[in-house]
């Protein structure tokens, strides 16, 4: 539950360090790792896709998969825009966020309740986590509902993102 | 896609910074900036207006927008409270994120979708950014039905936040 | 407004730190503190308990509350995932966040709102703070409808999570 | 100064409604909570509700069922109706301001101004 | 929503110190900072002593003061006068945003 040694409680004689300031400098919590990656126009399966043009620094992206390259604590938070043609019944959507493939967090909402077929109901749904991720860990997201994503109107508004907090080095 | 130089990869003979540790200091991800505010108590327009004595830390406040003092990538989040009366039809409450005056990423869900004249229903709507921002960028927040935030009995909930993650010096 | 002296612009020569790099360095921004809790299996009254073995890193768990080690700025963010067996009226859903007993920041949703006995709504709701926090200062999270907080079937959505963006040594 | 003062019949028959106004004067009824509180005779306060100047209520879960608050603010008046009432109801009522400033956070300061309450009886 | 629970009564002679306690559950005292404290004469209306906690309004005495530990409440009354006999309530902010009450003490001036 301690805080491992920062410049405030650096050892200053012998130990790991000692005065030698570039080994201090060298432990730093200095990396930054991001993405912010936008959902792909035509989706086709459970598992999203992304538009690989998107921010990414220090992270890869690969057949849906955010790819870490740098291990440490990351926040990573998804948001997806979903727009539903109210069928007879209620609807259940849902957000998986899933981290090497094992769903980790996940979000529900229930829609058009009233059992009334309105025209349209939008609805907006997040996710956060906060994990310590080592390299090569994969984050992705599945939608059961992926027909519901609204990638036309609102193309923008369905993103993945992530950022390293703190590194493990 | 590889992390810029940092202490971990500095070069230690000749190149920029050489072992000029002061310099490789002042390249270090020190600056942080920040903001926290609370939605004006009345609002007349779809552009919403903050209480200006809120945190504000590296970054500016003027006529509705935040004010980018410092280059870098910034994390933004805004989060609004709505207490809508229903009429006898369904309402689409929207929360638009600008960036520069342009709708960056926006936010909707329906409410009231049962058709019935309910005495009050609430909603909170939320919104995220991570995004490159230079000097004198600014973010504003719009909102269609803005006499739907609940401005006088959830006050304090109604806010616009942004912090930097990485600068971009 | 301003920024406190980063080493972008530390004085060089007289003042605080001149250029005793090693002073430089113990005031820079290294503290890291952060803390990912999901919530108890068995609730039992409108304050939320927390699963202690989660993450925790220069906080401390203690009766239902995180309680702050080191000083600063900090981002706080919970999430909630609530399934309700609709009654015959609507159902208003409140996240409340404090900080030392004081309510700073709540989200409300209303959900059931057609006036039908529906088998399940699923409903998700999330808040956030933005907030300077002192040593041994309290956080916790209050739920009129605690038996509406899913800890069954998803027993890892229910979350409350901080960490700290900036020290303020 | 703020004053509060309430009004409305003295005597109820059971199972009718009890109905109470209360006139806010020399302030706004505007951005504030108004609670009805009651006092059977020799006995404790009893929070019966609270209603925003924006129509919101809260009210006491175990009259919930029987308990209507409403505001008209363009006469600066709150009241309250109490349905199916019993001689369990007789009490004095009072009506109160809520101390409720916001600033940088809520304070629930709890009733600040009361009226001086009016006895209400419940009988055939 | 149980009341919150007072002593029916407590006494104590002028010049004194005493504490009236109240205990209230996880869900009011035991969450919230939400506490308030009311002094009622026989045939008037409650009046605000202290809120949240330990705050006083203006125009009450600095003799009058408040505290919490867990779920109970406390008023104490130092420097005991005459005037201070009367009947005295506590209350607290509750989940589900609502108010609940003591039962009330008796405070007796011998």
């Known amino acids: 539950d301690s805080i491992p040694n920062s410049p405030d409680n650096v050892p200053l004689k012998g130990g790991d360090c000692s005065e030698d300031l570039l080994c201090i400098l060298k432990r730093a919590p200095f990396k930054k790792s991001w993405a912010y990656l936008q959902v792909a126009k035509h989706l086709d399966k459970t598992k999203l896709s992304w538009n690989k043009d998107g921010i990414l620094h220090g992270v890869r992206y690969q057949d849906g998969n955010l790819v870490i390259q740098f291990p440490g604590l990351y926040f990573i938070i998804c948001q997806l825009q979903f727009l539903v043609q109210c069928p007879q019944n209620s609807v259940d959507l849902k957000l998986e966020l899933l981290i090497n493939k094992h769903i980790k967090k996940q979000a529900l909402v229930t829609v058009c309740e009233s059992g009334m077929q309105t025209k349209h109901v939008y609805q907006n749904l997040s996710q956060f986590l906060l994990d310590y991720l080592q390299v090569d860990t994969t984050i992705s997201v599945n939608v059961d509902t992926f027909q519901y994503i609204d990638t036309s109107t609102f193309p923008l508004e369905n993103v993945l993102s992530i950022f390293l907090y703190s590194n493990s080095d | 896609d590889s992390i810029p130089n940092s202490p971990d990869n500095v070069p230690l003979k000749g190149g920029d910074c050489s072992e000029d540790l002061l310099c490789i200091l002042k390249r270090a991800p020190f600056k942080k900036s920040w903001a926290y505010l609370q939605v004006a108590k009345h609002l007349d327009k779809t552009k919403l207006s903050w209480n200006k004595d809120g945190i504000l830390h590296g970054v500016r406040y003027q006529d509705g927008n935040l004010v980018i003092q410092f280059p870098g990538l910034y994390f933004i989040i805004c989060q609004l409270q709505f207490l809508v009366q229903c009429p006898q039809n369904s309402v689409d409450l929207k929360l638009e994120l600008l960036i520069n005056k342009h709708i960056k990423k926006q936010a909707l869900v329906t409410v009231c979708e049962s058709g019935m004249q309910t005495k009050h229903v609430y909603q909170n709507l939320s919104q995220f950014l991570l995004d490159y921002l230079q000097v004198d960028t600014t973010i504003s927040v719009n909102v269609d039905t803005f006499q739907y935030i609940d401005t006088s009995t959830f006050p304090l909930e109604n806010v616009l936040s942004i912090f930097l993650y990485s600068n971009s010096d | 407004d301003s920024i406190p002296n980063s080493p972008d612009n530390v004085p060089l020569k007289g003042g605080d730190c001149s250029e005793d790099l090693l002073c430089i360095l113990k005031r820079a921004p290294f503290k890291k503190s952060w803390a990912y809790l999901q919530v108890a299996k068995h609730l039992d009254k409108t304050k939320l308990s927390w699963n202690k073995d989660g993450i925790l890193h220069g906080v401390r768990y203690q009766d239902g509350n995180l309680v702050i080690q080191f000083p600063g700025l900090y981002f706080i963010i919970c999430q909630l995932q609530f399934l309700v067996q609709c009654p015959q009226n609507s159902v208003d859903l409140k996240l409340e966040l404090l900080i030392n007993k004081h309510i700073k920041k709540q989200a409300l949703v209303t959900v059931c709102e057609s006036g039908m006995q529906t088998k399940h709504v699923y409903q998700n709701l999330s808040q956030f703070l933005l907030d300077y926090l002192q040593v041994d200062t309290t956080i916790s999270v209050n739920v009129d409808t605690f038996q509406y907080i899913d800890t069954s079937t998803f027993p890892l959505e229910n979350v409350l999570s901080i960490f700290l963006y900036s020290n303020s040594d | 100064q703020v004053q509060l003062q309430e009004s409305g019949p003295r005597l109820v028959k059971p199972s009718e409604t009890l109905s109470l106004t209360c006139t806010v004067s020399?302030?706004?009824?505007?951005?504030?909570?108004w609670s009805w509180i009651r006092q059977p005779a020799g006995k404790g306060l009893e929070w019966i509700g609270r209603v925003y100047s924006s129509g919101l209520t809260n009210y006491k879960p175990s009259l919930k069922s029987r308990v209507t608050m409403s505001v008209d603010t363009s006469k600066n008046q709150f009241s309250l109706r109490l349905n199916s009432v019993t001689a369990a109801d007789t009490a004095v009522y009072y009506c109160?301001?809520?101390?409720?400033?916001?600033?940088?956070?809520?304070?629930?300061?709890?009733?600040?101004?009361w009226g001086q309450g009016t006895s209400v009886t419940v009988s055939s | 929503q149980s009341a919150l629970t007072q002593p029916a009564s407590v006494s104590g002679s002028p010049g004194q110190s005493i504490t009236i306690s109240c205990t209230g559950s996880s869900s009011d005292i035991g969450t919230y900072n939400y506490v308030s404290w009311y002094q009622q004469y026989p045939g008037k209306a409650p009046e605000l002593m202290i809120y949240?906690?330990?705050n006083r309004p203006s125009g009450v005495s600095d003799r009058f003061s408040g505290s919490t530990s867990g779920n109970t409440a406390s008023l104490t009354i130092s420097g005991l006068q005459a005037n201070d006999e009367a009947d005295y309530y506590c209350s607290s902010y509750s989940s589900s945003s609502t108010w609940v009450f003591g039962g009330g003490t008796k405070l007796t001036v011998l």
């Open positions: 109160a301001r809520e101390r409720a400033t916001v600033t940088t956070r809520y304070h629930y300061d709890g009733m600040d101004v």
């Open positions: 020399g302030g706004s009824i505007t951005n504030n909570y």
């Open positions: 949240e906690v330990n």
